[in-house]
Interface confidence: low
């Protein structure tokens, strides 16, 4: 017997559906109506036939009362080929829900997204996460998707993007966006970062994550941030193969004074990189290849420095007379 595609936990909190049959019984998903967290994985299916069975242009207001009654706050949709028209139809209906966090992963969006009708209401998300989502529209996908969202988005995560650079002139500002995560885009690089950080479109960013994005030097990242006018409080550059030295002919880049936390862990560093901010509250240099303790003049003025997992430290022990510099936690490097 084939297992049930959908499983709802005992608390009616989390519901996970895995539709792997070639012609799944989508009605099974109705058991998720009472769940707060819903995950739907479509097994790589092409959802084009769905368009024949639903009226994507129907007025979504007719479903408003039903949708408002749903408990879902977090929705994940994955592993499917989705016509843009169907995605838009879903977003229009979900606009009447209490959905706050939407995750799209392993999706191929085909066709172009129509413009938002005047009478339509946007989806009031606080968090949007995309992983390995490809769009037929290339660089304009963010602008097209953005028009279906209300401007209160606080968290945007884009991983394994096929086009991590955006068509900046089409993108509107994200006035409430405080966290931007572009991690796991290894082809991005510093120039790509410049293209992705559309100037003046991300005025409120406080947390910027750039793990595994092909960054080369902190100075290069500093330049890209300065060019875009982005001033994060926290910057994560971990899991990049960073160079410690700066091109001697390259001028110093002035870091924003707003930056107080910098993560340089798992960066393959054999010495503390040049060109760091002069003053930081938090600096994470754990799990690098530092063969000796950094000299004070190699470091920024820093309140909380993490050095665990470097060769010069015997795991689990602090430096003599410098115990306060280490968290004492032994990471698995």
């Amino acid at each position: 017997t084939t297992p049930e595609p959908c499983e709802l936990d005992d608390e009616d909190f989390r519901c996970v559906c895995n539709f792997s049959e070639p012609q799944p019984d989508w009605s099974e998903a109705f058991q998720c109506v009472s769940a707060v967290e819903v995950e739907i994985h479509a097994g790589g299916l092409n959802l084009e036939p769905f368009l024949k069975r639903v009226d994507a242009d129907a007025d979504p207001r007719q479903y408003a009362d039903t949708v408002k009654a749903l408990r879902v706050r977090r929705l994940t949709v994955g592993a499917a080929q989705v016509p843009a028209q169907l995605l838009v139809g879903a977003l229009r209906v979900l606009a009447y829900s209490r959905l706050k966090e939407l995750t799209l992963e392993d999706l191929k969006i085909t066709g172009t997204m129509p413009p938002l009708p005047l009478e339509a209401t946007g989806l009031a998300l606080s968090s949007l996460r995309l992983r390995n989502v490809s769009w037929a529209t290339g660089r304009s996908w963010l602008a097209e998707l953005q028009q279906w969202l209300k401007p209160g988005l606080k968290v945007l995560s884009i991983a394994q993007a096929h086009s991590p650079a955006f068509s900046c002139e089409q993108v509107r500002a994200f006035p409430a966006l405080t966290s931007l995560d572009l991690s796991d885009n290894p082809g991005l690089g510093e120039r790509g970062l410049m293209a992705a950080l559309c100037p003046h479109k991300f005025p409120a960013i406080q947390n910027l994550a750039l793990r595994n994005t092909g960054m080369e030097t902190p100075t290069g990242v500093c330049a890209a941030l300065a060019a875009a006018g982005v001033q994060p409080h926290s910057l994560d550059l971990s899991h990049n193969s960073l160079r410690a030295t700066v091109n001697p002919s390259a001028p110093r880049c002035m870091w924003s004074s707003a930056l107080n936390s910098l993560n340089l862990s798992f960066a393959g560093l054999e010495q503390v990189p040049k060109g760091l901010p002069a003053k930081l509250r938090v600096l994470d240099l754990s799990c690098n290849r530092l063969n000796r303790a950094p000299q004070p003049d190699e470091l920024p003025e820093v309140d909380n420095l993490t050095l665990d997992g470097n060769p010069f430290l015997v795991p689990g022990t602090a430096l003599p007379h410098e115990g306060s510099m280490n968290s004492g936690v032994v990471p698995a490097c």
């Epitope: 120039r191 410049m194 100037p199 330049a223 890209a224 300065a226 110093r252 880049c253």
Partner: nanobody
Framework: QVQLQESGGGSVQTGESLRLSCVAS????????MGWYRQTLGDQREMVAT???????RYADAVKGRFTISRDNAKSAVYLQMNSLNREDTAVYYC????????????????WGQGTQVTVSS
């Protein structure tokens, strides 16, 4: 200091072709959008074509299908291949680039070339 050096302008007959080149030099870190604009006497400068770092091009309606913009990121250069030229294409052509450059610190701003004259006569 950053400079944009244009070349390739000149006088041609209607229906002929020209290729304009523009190279950015100086303390350049990276170059964002690049483009070509033109201006006739007494008129506003108008966009002819622009191209972003990824190679996505935009054209003015008047030149679509006749002009092709391209760039070489390694050389910080932009080119404009102009085919089927007509008298309305007569103008001074200006190169434009959005450049992250190095002075005392990093800066990013638009730079303009000095312009190169293109004259099309019948």
């Amino acid at each position: 200091q950053v400079q944009l050096q244009e070349s390739g302008g000149g006088s041609v007959q209607t229906g002929e072709s020209l290729r304009l080149s523009c190279v950015a030099s100086g303390n350049i870190r990276s170059v964002g959008d690049m483009g070509w604009y033109r201006q006739t006497l007494g008129d506003q400068r108008e966009m002819v074509a622009t191209i972003d770092y990824g190679g996505v091009a935009r054209y003015a309606d008047a030149v679509k299908g006749r002009f092709t913009i391209s760039r070489d990121n390694a050389k910080s250069a932009v080119y404009l291949q102009m085919n089927s030229l007509n008298r309305e294409d007569t103008a001074v052509y200006y190169c434009n680039a959005d450049i992250l450059y190095k002075s005392d610190s990093y800066a990013r701003r638009e730079f303009w070339g000095q312009g190169t004259q293109v004259t099309v006569s019948s």
